[in-house]
Structure formats: C-alpha cells, structure tokens
C-alpha cells in the first residue's frame, strides 16, 4: 500500500498485535497474564465448553452487533408523511366496531406518489397521537393481510399519562410490501392485547382520530393529528444517479 | 491543543467547515446550491413546517441512534449459566398444566451465586431449545409477578423448522430485579399469543425439557438442554476495581 | 461496505479492512487462554483522501464524498466501523472462567 | 464518555468533542436551507497516545487503554462515536423539500 | 494497607513441632491463596506449599508432604503452618506470602525465625 | 521441577552504577517471571511481575525484560538504599521455584 509514504504493512501487523495483548488484558482487567501454574491436566471441563459454545453461537431472536451503514443509506432520505384516510371513508364500514381495536387506512396511490418505487423507502414509521391515558395499557398493531386476516406486526406497553404524545411503530416492511402490490387501500389495526386467560380485552388508549362530536377549528387540528406514516426514501433522481455511479473501487 | 506539532485549532474548525459544506451538498447530491429564485415569498408553508418537526422531534418507541457503550461495559463480562429447576421439582405443581402455556422456574440462590449484586449484571438470557415445529407459531413471554399474576415481557414469530433450534429472550432487567428481591424461586411462563378473536390458542411448539417418557442417556442429554438463563456479569472483584479507579482524566 | 466479503478479495489502496489472523500461542507467547486458540482480529488500513474545498471539481468529489470523507471530518482516519465479540476460555488459579470481549473482531472500516 | 458534558466543561487536552457551531448564512455563504437557520455540528479532536509496549508501566496502562485504544488499532485516531441526524428544509424551484441527513452532528468522540 | 504479620521466633527441639501463624488486614482474607516459603540460612527461598482460604483447598510441595500442614481460620484471618518431627536442617525463617494469579507473591510476611537444636 | 540459575551470585558496585543480573530457568517459563528485594530484618518485597511489569511504588530505575528462558533484572543507577539480595521466581508451573539470589554489596 503506498500513501505519500509506503505503509510498511509488517510493522503495522506488529503494532496491532502487540496492541490486541495490551486490550485483551485490560478489557479482562489483568495486569499481566493468570499464570497456569495450578489448571488442572486434561480437557476443559465440559460445562465450560457447553458455556462457551453457547456464549458462542448466534441463537435466533437474539440481536446482532449494529450492521454496518448500507452505501445507500449514506445519502439524504426526503421525508414525507401520508395521513390516514379519514375515518368517515366507507372502508371503514366493513370492520366492525370493537372495544378492542381500532382501524387505520391508507392510500396506496399516495403512498406511491410519495415512493414510486419499494427499493427506494429506506423507512417508515407509523405515528399515532395518544390522548391521556389513565391505566397501562398493552396494546399490538396488526397490518390487514387478506379479505378478513391480520398478521400481527409488534406490540408497545405504554405507560398511564397526563399528556398526548406520539406513538411510533418501524413498518418499513410492510410499507415496502404494499409499494409492491396493487392495492388501493392498506391498513393496519391498533388492538389490546389479549391474554389466553384474561376476558377484559378492551382497548383503554385514546387515539386522536377516533374520537367524534368534534366541530369547526377543532377538528381541523384533530384531523391533521390524525395517523400517518412518515416516509424515508431516497428521491427517485438520486436513486437513478446513485445506479449510474454504483462501482467497485 | 499540543502534540508533537501545535494543532491550529482555527484551521481545524475551517477544514471541518468546508467539509461540511461538501457533505451536505454530496448527501443530496447535489452538484451546487439551488437556485433560491422560484421560492415563493413569506414564511414557509404550515404542511412543511409540521413535516419538519415531527421530523426533527424524537417520539416514544422510536429507537434513537445507538447509544455510546458506557465504560463499564468495555471490560469483560464473566459468562455463567444457571439451569431451569428440573419439572419433577414441587414448584411445577401449583401451576396448571394448560394447552397454551409451559413454566419455567429458577432457583434465585444460585443466580445470586453467579451475580453476587443486581447492578453487576450486564445482560441476562433466557435460552429455549425449541424441537423441530410442523406450523408458524406466535409465543409470548411472561414474568411471573405475584401469586397468580403474570407480567408480558415480549413475543416472538417462530417459523416451521425441521431442525431443533435455540431461541433466546433478553431478560436482563427481569433478573436484574430477581437479584433485588428476596424470592427463593421465580419464573417465566412461555404462551400462545392469543388473538382476541381466535379461539385456537394451543402452544405447538415443542421446548426441550418438557416432554415426558425419556430415559438414561436420552434423559441427561436432555436435561443437559433444558431451558437456562445465559447471564453476562462484571465479578465482584472487577467491579471493585473499577469503582476505586473510577475518575475524570 | 469496506468489509471483509469486498477487501479481502481486492487490491484496494484506500482504506480497507485487512487480513489478520491472532494465534494466541505464536504470536503473543501466551499459553493461558484456553479456547479459542486464536481468531481473526484483522484491523483497518489505508489513505482516507481529505477530498473537498472550494476549488475541488465538485463533479468528481461527490462520487467519492461518500468514502473518503462521509462525516466531513478535518481530517478523515480509517477505523473499524462493524465490530464482534470474542468469547474466551481462561483459567484464574484453580478456575475456569468464561468471558465475552467486546468489539474484538473487525469486520468492515470507514472513513471517520 | 467523551461526550459534549464532559468535553465542553473541560480543558481535555486529548481526543475529545469540540464545540463548533455552523451557522449556513455566515459560515457557509448559503441562503438556501430555510430550517434550520444553522446547527451544533462540532468536531473530534486531540491526541489518542498509543499506549501499549511490552516495556510499558503497565499499571498506568490499564486505567488508560479503555480512553486511549480501546479498539487495539496500530495508529488510534479520535474519530465520531456517537452522531445525530439532522432534517433541513430547502426548496427545489418552487418545491419544498424536508430531507433527513443522517450523521452530521457529532454527540460523542472515541479513540479507534 | 495490605499486611501479614508474623508470629514471633521459636527454638525448638529435633522430633518437635512448630506452628507458626500469620494474620492478614487490609484485604479480604479469602480471595487470595496465602503460600508458605522458607530460607534457611545463607541459601535461597524455597516454596512449601499453599491454602485457599475459600475452599480450603491446600497443595504441598513433594519435600514436605506428611510433614506439613496448612491450616486457616477465616473468623480471624489467620493463616498457620505447622511442622512436625523437625530436624535441624528446618532450621530456617518461614515466611507466609499473598499469592496472586498473575504468577507472583504481592505482599509477605516479615517472616519468623524456627530454630532447632538439641 | 524447574530449576533457576542466577547470576552472579554476588556484585561489587558504587552508587550510579548501571547494574545487571541474569536468570536462567531449565524450560520456558513463558514470561512469569519475577524478582524479587530482600534486606536484613525486612518483609521481601516484589519489584518486577511478568518479567517487566513494574509493581506499584516501585521507581522506574528498576527494569526488567526477556523471554523463553532468559531474564534479566537491570538497575540504571544505584541508589544507596539498592543494596541488598535480588531474587528470581517462575510462576509459570509448579513448585514455584526461585533462583540463589544475588547480593548486591557496596564497593
């Protein structure tokens, strides 16, 4: 490798390895090495090796080291944000009210104008306004997947309050997915969650949104608060460019 | 600031500035500023100013960007694990066998053996071997709390496998308060998400260490692989040495 | 990504992730850790190119901004961007200990 | 952590965070980022000694490693840890855009 | 301050024993081996053998099994060696010394005097 | 068991002097190495762990280095309060086992 001055690569595989035994014995806290004076003959133990081996290995559900930063995601996102269809829409009249759910919906085809293409979304959130909410509530979002079928998404404790304050749930993926199909209207579903045993399943949170009766000025705001997704995504040009450009150096 | 050579720290904060004219421009890849001659007069629009700021706003549940690592967690961590009380133990007895759930308790004596004090404990495991699994399993995960009350910690989408598969569930704050408290035995009960709706809640999925009729070698094996709490600890000694040692340079 | 998967299989002058593989025995004299007998450290190597001023053809910087100089440093260093923990065997005295370093294992570099 | 807390109430001579205020008219000449008017981008600067030879006083060593070269690199390098995004709003013609530029300000420095 | 104090000078008779004890402050008793050393005169330091005081756990050199025994009391932090049918060539200062892991002996005792002569 | 071989067995020096004594064990003791200051009526006292480590409170005038099976103890300049008998040990296997000593003396 040569910069104005040639890197001897040896010397500086000798400075690493000779730094790797000075943070190997400080990370271990160690001023020098444990002498092996007193370790017993023979294999290590087998819990230990059990305990290694499970230290080890990845296990599903259990999270990585953060990935590295995708090229992509280097350059600026633009941000969008689509509301939900309002709740006066007919889509709404085909899901029954419940105590325990309630149904948001969106626009695909503003969704669309917004990323034209799925590659491009680089995030997507869904924010809800919650109203005060007097008991802790568990509650799970669902995104609408067949004619009268839910696939459960995530799920958020939230905690009593005096105050509104916004909710935010990752559905990049579902959002990418719809981007690919032809639908018109997509949806999600705010539910309590229910326990196998427990039968008072009634959703306690108050969305702005979903409340009625209101009049004038009032509901305006109320409905600009209403859900939306805020979109991420690399403009459709920059994307075009980032194509073009994309090599090997 | 002084090395070897005086560092201009003015010329420093001008390099830095001029990259940071490149860096903004390179990020929206842009060539050169726009043009400002098309932008319509006054005050930016409402609509704008609201996206800016539910941008700009951080919300509950949104993940910021990754926390620096505290100092105590650049040293090592001391693995140990501690294994499930075994099924025949009385414990099992007062709770009911049901379709949608399976206990799992743990002896706190030799947690506290492992993790001498809460504030130690640097992450805690619940690891599940799970046997193979004909169809998509939704599971949840529940602390138990009080004498017949249980507390939801998280859920987790299992997808049909033919092989057995380890799962892990991060329970560090649920051992961290173990540690704190003086119950001799605590546990978690593995369920069936329950959809308000439906009414097939059975628990599919097959946990090494819960089913019956195995015997000799088979039966040890299987112990060996009974669900377990994997814990990652600062040893007392450590801690001590950090504590004393602890100052602003 | 410079990760392993692209610099190792390249002949990339600027700043890249490096091949290095640590065997405890041989190339640090210690005998005490148990398992693993060693394990690839690598370590990040190579010029970062301090690429923007008024006067630079802006044209040829922004293709480039991103590599050389992505968080608009004075003076952008090749370090470790995706790091992994290493789990280690050890004996203190008479006892086995098993521990779990953190950010040992470089994976992939940046310029920072 | 060597964060805007510790570095901005301190006289820290090595690898730290440095205060450094953009703002887009003044510093940069640009009347074309309506929000926001300018932002706390601040730098990482000053010494990461190399702290490790077998002849080293390995006392002093030890509290050191962690600030100094905690990731073990050859030549450390105070570079970023941890960095905010930044949304700006600027018009494209008669367009107004809100755009999220990730890491641009810098909340924390390291030694790597 | 880390300290072991010794216990005071002893003349002995050969075929007699010796005990000798050593009283640790300063630290926690039980979370470092204490060993036992011995220097006869004009000649070097030979080691004898040591104690966990955790576990109780105890390791004799070859030339002093049988003879030797280690003992602790972990109430006081004490630690003890005794020496049985002793001969004139034991004639020598016993030290008890700290272990510590890294492969070396931190913190001694002053060290007492076991002479013995008919 | 290992053996350590040190050397010289005693040395003439003044207040000053850069002084030097050697260690040599049977096998490779794999860097645990250690030496160690004994005066009349005194505790010992450890200097040096790990063949270079110095311990705490201990001034930088004392050194050490090697490897494998060769170790060596230097003082760059004598103080008067140096004079005394060094000793070696390998921690690496057991028995621990120390070198002879060397008695440094004033000339």
């Known amino acids: 490798l040569s910069t104005c001055k040639t890197i001897d690569m040896e010397l500086v595989k000798r400075k690493r390895i000779e730094a790797i035994r000075g943070q190997i014995l400080s990370k271990l806290r160690l001023a020098s090495p444990p002498s092996q004076g007193e370790v017993p003959p023979g294999p290590l133990p087998e819990a230990v090796l059990a305990l290694y081996n499970s230290t080890r290995d990845r296990v599903a559900g259990e999270s990585a080291e953060p990935e590295p930063e995708p090229e992509a995601d280097y350059y600026a996102k633009e941000v969008t944000r689509v509301l939900m269809v309002e709740t006066h829409n007919e889509i709404y009249d085909k899901f029954k009210q419940s105590t325990h759910s309630i149904y948001m919906f969106f626009n695909t085809s503003e969704l669309r104008e917004a990323v034209p293409e799925p590659v491009l979304l680089s995030r997507a959130e869904l924010r809800l306004l919650r109203l005060k909410l007097k008991v802790e509530q568990h509650v799970e979002l669902y995104q609408k997947y067949s004619n009268n079928s839910w696939r459960y998404l995530s799920n958020r404790l939230l905690a009593p309050s005096d105050s509104p304050e916004w909710l935010s749930f990752d559905v990049t993926g579902v959002v990418r997915q719809w981007l690919s199909r032809g639908g018109e209207i997509e949806g999600f579903r705010l539910s309590a969650h229910c326990s196998c045993d427990s039968r008072d399943n009634t959703l306690q949170v108050d969305i702005n949104g979903f409340t009625t009766g209101r009049r004038g000025d009032l509901a305006t705001i109320h409905g600009m608060n209403r859900p939306f997704l805020l979109l991420m995504a690399t403009p459709l040009e920059r994307a075009q460019h980032l194509q073009s450009s994309r090599h090997r150096r | 600031l002084s090395t070897c050579k005086t560092i201009d720290m003015e010329l420093v904060k001008r390099k830095r500035i001029e990259a940071i004219r490149g860096q903004i421009l390179s990020k929206l890849r842009l060539a050169s500023p726009p043009s400002q001659g098309e932008v319509p007069p006054g005050p930016l629009p409402e609509a704008v100013l609201a996206l800016y700021n539910s941008t700009r706003d951080r919300v509950a549940g949104e993940s910021a960007e990754p926390e620096p690592e505290p100092e105590a967690d650049y040293y090592a961590k001391e693995v140990t694990r501690v294994l499930m009380v075994e099924t025949h133990n009385e414990i099992y007895d007062k709770f009911k066998q049901s379709t949608h759930s399976i206990y799992m308790f743990f002896n706190t004596s030799e947690l506290r053996e492992a993790v001498p004090e809460p504030v130690l404990l640097s992450r805690a495991e619940l690891r599940l071997l799970r046997l193979k699994l004909k169809v998509e399993q939704h599971v949840e995960l529940y602390q138990k709390y009080s004498n017949n009350s249980w507390r939801y910690l998280s859920n987790r989408l299992l997808a049909p496998s033919d092989s057995p598969e380890w799962l892990s569930f991060d329970v560090t704050g649920v051992v961290r308060q173990w540690l704190s408290r003086g119950g001799e035995i605590e546990g978690f009960r593995l369920s069936a998400h329950c959809s308000c709706d439906s009414r097939d809640n059975t628990l599919q999925v097959d946990i090494n260490g819960f089913t019956t009729g195995r015997r000799g070698d088979l039966a040890t094996i299987h112990g060996m692989n009974r669900p377990f709490l994997l814990l990652m600890a600062t040893p007392l000694e450590r801690a001590q040495h950090l504590q004393s040692s602890r100052h602003r340079r | 990504a410079l990760d392993t998967n692209y610099c190792f299989s390249s002949t990339e002058k600027n700043c890249c992730v490096r091949q290095l593989y640590i065997d405890f025995r041989k190339d640090l004299g210690w005998k005490w850790i148990h398992e693993p007998k060693g394990y690839h450290a690598n370590f990040c190597l190579g010029p970062c190119p301090y690429i923007w001023s008024l006067d630079t053809q802006y044209s040829k910087v922004l293709a480039l901004y991103n590599q050389h100089n992505p968080g608009a440093s004075a003076a952008p260093c090749c370090v470790p961007q995706a790091l992994e923990p290493l789990p280690i065997v050890y004996y203190v005295g008479r006892k086995p200990k098993v521990e779990q370093l953190s950010n040992m294992i470089v994976r992939s570099c940046k310029c920072s | 952590a060597l964060d805007t807390n510790y570095c901005f109430s301190s006289t820290e001579k090595n690898c730290c965070v440095r205060q450094l205020y953009i703002d887009f008219r003044k510093d940069l000449g640009w009347k074309w980022i309506h929000e926001p008017k300018g932002y706390h981008a601040n730098f990482c600067l000053g010494p990461c000694p190399y702290i490790w030879s077998l002849d080293t006083q390995y006392s002093k060593v030890l509290a050191l490693y962690n600030q100094h070269n905690p990731g073990a690199s050859a030549a450390p390098c105070c570079v970023p840890q941890a960095l905010e995004p930044l949304p700006i709003v600027y018009y494209v013609g008669r367009k107004p855009k809100v755009e999220q530029l990730s890491n641009m300000i810098v909340r924390s420095c390291k030694c790597s | 301050e880390v300290q072991l104090v010794q216990s005071g000078a002893e003349v002995k008779k050969p075929g007699a024993s010796v005990k000798v004890s050593c009283k640790a402050s300063g630290y926690t008793f039980t979370s470092y081996d204490m060993h036992w050393v011995r220097q006869a005169p004009g000649q070097g330091l030979e080691w004898m053998g040591r104690i966990d005081p955790q576990s109780g756990g105890i390791k004799y050199a070859q030339k002093f099994q049988g003879r030797a025994t280690l003992t602790v009391d972990t109430s006081t932090s004490t630690a003890y060696m005794e020496l049985s049918r002793l001969r004139s060539d034991d004639t020598a200062v016993y030290y008890c010394a700290r272990w510590d892991y890294g492969g070396y002996f931190d913190v001694w005792g002053q060290g007492t005097l076991v002479t013995v002569s008919s | 068991d290992i053996q350590m071989t040190q050397s010289p067995s005693s040395l003439s020096a003044s207040v000053g002097d850069r002084v030097t004594i050697t260690c040599r064990a049977s096998q490779d003791i794999y860097n645990y190495l250690n030496w160690y200051q004994q005066k009349p009526g005194k505790a010992v006292k450890l200097l040096i762990y790990?063949?270079?480590r110095l311990e705490t409170g201990v001034p930088s005038r004392f050194s050490g280095s090697g490897s494998g099976t060769d170790y060596t103890l230097t003082i760059s300049s004598l103080q008067p309060e140096d004079f005394a008998t060094y000793f070696c040990q390998q921690g690496d296997t057991l028995p621990w086992t120390f070198g002879q000593g060397t008695k440094l003396e004033i000339k």
């Open positions: 790990y063949t270079s």
